[in-house]
Each structure stands twice: as C-alpha cells, then as structure tokens.
C-alpha cells in the first residue's frame, strides 16, 4: 500500500499541454502510475505515464493536440487523477478538478536575438511560444542580465508590465560579455506562475572607441 503525504500539481501551457508533478512520501519507486485527464465537456480524454524525477516525485506531460491548437477554453474544467497499478487493479492516489486557465504556466520565450548592440546598450527581442490568443496583450515579462563575476540569482529583475517582446538594456560596460534571460506570465489565473526562464542569450558590448571618453 502507498501512504504518506501526497501533492499533485499541474499547469496548463494555454494551448495543448498540461504538465503535472505528483509527489508522495513513502511511495514505492517501482510502482507504475499515470495521470488521467477527463474534460467535463469534451469527447476526448488523455493519459500520460508518470516518470520519476526525484526520490519521491514523478512528472508527466499530457499532450492534448498539436502544439498551437486551442484544446481547452476558459470554461473547461478537467478532472485530473493519479492512478497507480496495484497488482491487476488501478488505485486512485490523487484527484483534482482542474481549471486550466486558473493554473497557467506558459512555455519559455524563444528566438532571443540581439537586434542592435553598442558600447553601453543592447536591444534584444524574443518571441512567446505556444501562447493562447486569448491573452491579447495582457502578459507581463521579467528579464535579467548576467554580468561578469555574478550569478543569475544576484541579477536584478527587470519587469515589463505589458506584452513587450523586446528590451533595451542600458548602462552596460563596453567590450564585456553578458548573458540575458526572459520569462513570461499571463495576468489571468489565481494559481498562474512564471514560465521557465528562456535559454540564455550571450552577447558582447562593443569596445569603446580609442581616444574617446567612455
């Protein structure tokens, strides 16, 4: 038998993916478990196999359709269950009535690129990926720049309170290597959280012109 404290957390990427993590203290590592998704008003259902990510937690992705298809709407409620095999039977370990657009985590921004770089500033753009058209412009971004000799955790956060897919970094040091990351979050959703950080974009500022003050 499996007992102990259970935690079952899922997020919708706003298009065609629900990612879930289930953690259970005292769970058996070799138990076969799945997440089952049953929307309240749709003809389809979906299952994914939970795979271990640590000693007592498992994760899986419910793929609902092609990446950019709008598979759930603002009024859908999805019953999500963790089912684990016990011999020849399946036992329900966790259940939740999941409101997709109250539990959002978008994909990390992609296609980061340097639009223009100078000695002291750099203009960077990016794109959002697999984000619903539902949000219109009601998204916010956080960005951070990694300076030499510092860690990402030390980097101050810059907040963009609107759907602005570019930033102009100022007061940079000439001829210096930097890295840049950005993440996105919709305003919608009580339990919505930030996307993962984008892949870092490395760039170098231009050297100061010789014989000029910098």
């Amino acid at each position: 038998a499996v007992n102990g404290t259970s935690r079952f957390t899922c997020f919708y990427n706003s298009r065609a993916n629900i990612s879930c993590v289930w953690s259970q203290d005292g769970a058996l590592q070799d138990t076969s478990c799945q997440v089952h998704a049953w929307p309240d008003r749709r003809r389809w259902n979906q299952t994914c196999e939970l795979l271990p990510v640590s000693q007592a937690s498992w994760a899986c992705n419910l793929i609902l359709g092609t990446p950019d298809s709008q598979k759930l709407t603002a009024v859908d409620i999805v019953t999500l269950r963790v089912m684990c095999r016990e011999g020849v039977r399946w036992r329900m370990m966790a259940i939740q009535d999941f409101k997709p657009f109250e539990n959002l985590r978008l994909m990390a921004p992609i296609s980061l690129q340097v639009v223009h770089v100078e000695t002291h500033r750099c203009n960077i753009s990016w794109k959002i990926s697999q984000a619903s058209h539902y949000f219109e412009r009601h998204l916010e971004f956080e960005a951070r720049t990694l300076s030499p000799g510092h860690t990402w955790e030390e980097a101050p956060l810059m907040t963009l309170k609107q759907k602005q897919e570019w930033i102009c970094l100022e007061t940079l040091t000439p001829d210096t290597q930097y890295e840049f990351q950005v993440r996105v979050k919709p305003l919608q959703g009580e339990f919505t959280t930030w996307s993962p950080w984008s892949q870092p974009l490395a760039f170098r500022t231009k050297p100061a012109a010789l014989g000029k003050d910098t």
Epitope: A74, H133, E136, H138, Q188
Partner: antibody, heavy 117, light 107 residues
Framework: EVQLVQSGAEVKKPGATVKISCKVS????????VHWVQQAPGKGLEWMGW????????EYAPGFQDRVTITADTSTDTAYMELSSLRSEDTAVYYC??????????WGQGTTVTVSS | EIVMTQSPATLSVSPGERATLSCRAS??????LHWYQQKPGQAPRLLII???QSISGIPARFSGSRSGTEFTLTISSLQSEDFAVYFC?????????FGQGTKLEIK
C-alpha cells in the same frame, strides 16, 4: 484603430428571428474572440456567448443557448448573432465586443432590437 | 450562477471629490473581476481588469482593490466626464455575470 461596426436597428414580431452583423477592423479577426452581450431595460447586461474565429468554436450562456447562434465569416471579418423565437423581453440593445474570454476590451456601437406585435 | 451586487445603486458626489463604488460577489471569484464605465447612448468601456490592473489609456484616477469577495472601484478626484454608470463583471464561473450598475451623478 480597433473598430466593431454593427448593423442597424430592427423591429420584429414575436416568434420571429433576428440576425445582427458585426464587421470588425483594426485587428486580426482570426486571432480573436467576438462576444455578444444583451442590455435589456429591466435586466441589465447579460453575456450571450462568443465565437473563437481561430477555430470556429462557440460558447453560449445557458440562458441563451437554446435560441442563439453565433457565427463568423473570416473572409469578410464579420461576426453574426442570430436570436430566434423572439419575445417581448428580448427587446434590448445588443452589443458585439472583442476580447479574450474573460472581459471585453472593445465594443460595437450597439444594435437596438424591438420585439412588438 | 454567480450574483454580483453593486452598491449603492446611485451615488451623488461633487466634482473634485473621491467616489467609492462597491461590488460584492455571491461566492469567491479570486481576482476575476472587471470594471466598465457606460455613458448614456454609448457602449460600455473597459476600465480595470483582474480587480486592480488598469487598462492603458484609462486615467490614473481610476483604481481598483479587493477584499475577499468585495471589490472597490475608486475615482480619486471626479471630473465632469466621469459621471456615468459603472458595472462590475465576474469571469470566475461561466456564465460570466455583471452587476446591476451604480449610477454616479453630480451632487
């Protein structure tokens, strides 16, 4: 500039059907939801439903779903709302609006429908 | 269906003064509450989303707040163009529903 331009006022007899159009401009029609809202004198604002032009999916409020049909013509960037089996309490101003599912960012000018025998 | 109750039905305030409009939900709606302004003969106009987020182009004198199921729209210093009817709207449970409106009139 975002604009939603609705068809003109209608006078209908009880039991008839009315169809109102909403021509949109200033944004990508295929990337948007068009909603319909009723504002009747004694009842206030009531959400009727919406259509998602990206995939043609509709959502109707329970109080209207038996009588309302929302459609969209992506070739002309026009949404339509058809209300059947009209009764006197359907006398109202009907608005189309653009927005995500949760709130209405831009509104049409409204279409007055009078139901009278 | 969630019932949205606005109070007062009519509010009389002098220009330059502060106006406080209330909207209460019949059940918990998180921050899924939006405010609109409607002037006679016009369509409603979106002012505030998610309880407190201002829409671009809306003057800074309009602000929103939340305490549990009670939401407040505050207009800090009333201008002549602010006298109108104000509606709240919830988007927590379908069908989305509106309050009956508060008419803000000149005192």
């Amino acid at each position: 500039e975002v604009q939603l331009v609705q068809s003109g006022a209608e006078v209908k007899k009880p039991g008839a059907t009315v169809k109102i159009s909403c021509k949109v401009s200033g944004f990508n029609f295929k990337d948007s939801l068009v909603h319909w809202v009723q504002q009747a004198p004694g009842k206030g604002l009531e959400w009727m439903g919406w259509i998602d032009s990206e995939n043609g999916e509709t959502e109707y409020a329970p109080g209207f779903q038996d009588r309302v049909t929302i459609t969209a013509d992506t070739s002309t960037d026009t949404a339509y709302m058809e209300l059947s089996s009209l009764r006197s309490e359907d006398t109202a101003v009907y608005y189309c609006a653009r927005g995500g599912p949760w709130f209405l960012s831009y509104w049409g000018q409204g279409t007055t429908v009078t139901v009278s025998s | 269906e969630i019932v949205m109750t606005q109070s007062p039905a009519t509010l009389s305030v002098s220009p330059g003064e502060r106006a406080t409009l209330s909207c209460r939900a019949s059940q918990i709606i998180s921050n899924n509450l939006h405010w609109y302004q409607q002037k006679p003969g016009q369509a409603p106009r979106l002012l505030i989303i998610y309880g407190l987020q201002s829409i671009s182009g809306i003057p800074a004198r309009f602000s929103g707040s939340r305490s549990g199921t009670e939401f407040t729209l505050t207009i800090s210093s009333l201008q002549s163009e602010d006298f109108a009817v104000y509606f709240c709207q919830q988007s927590n449970n379908w069908p989305w529903t509106f309050g009956q409106g508060t008419k803000l009139e000149i005192k």
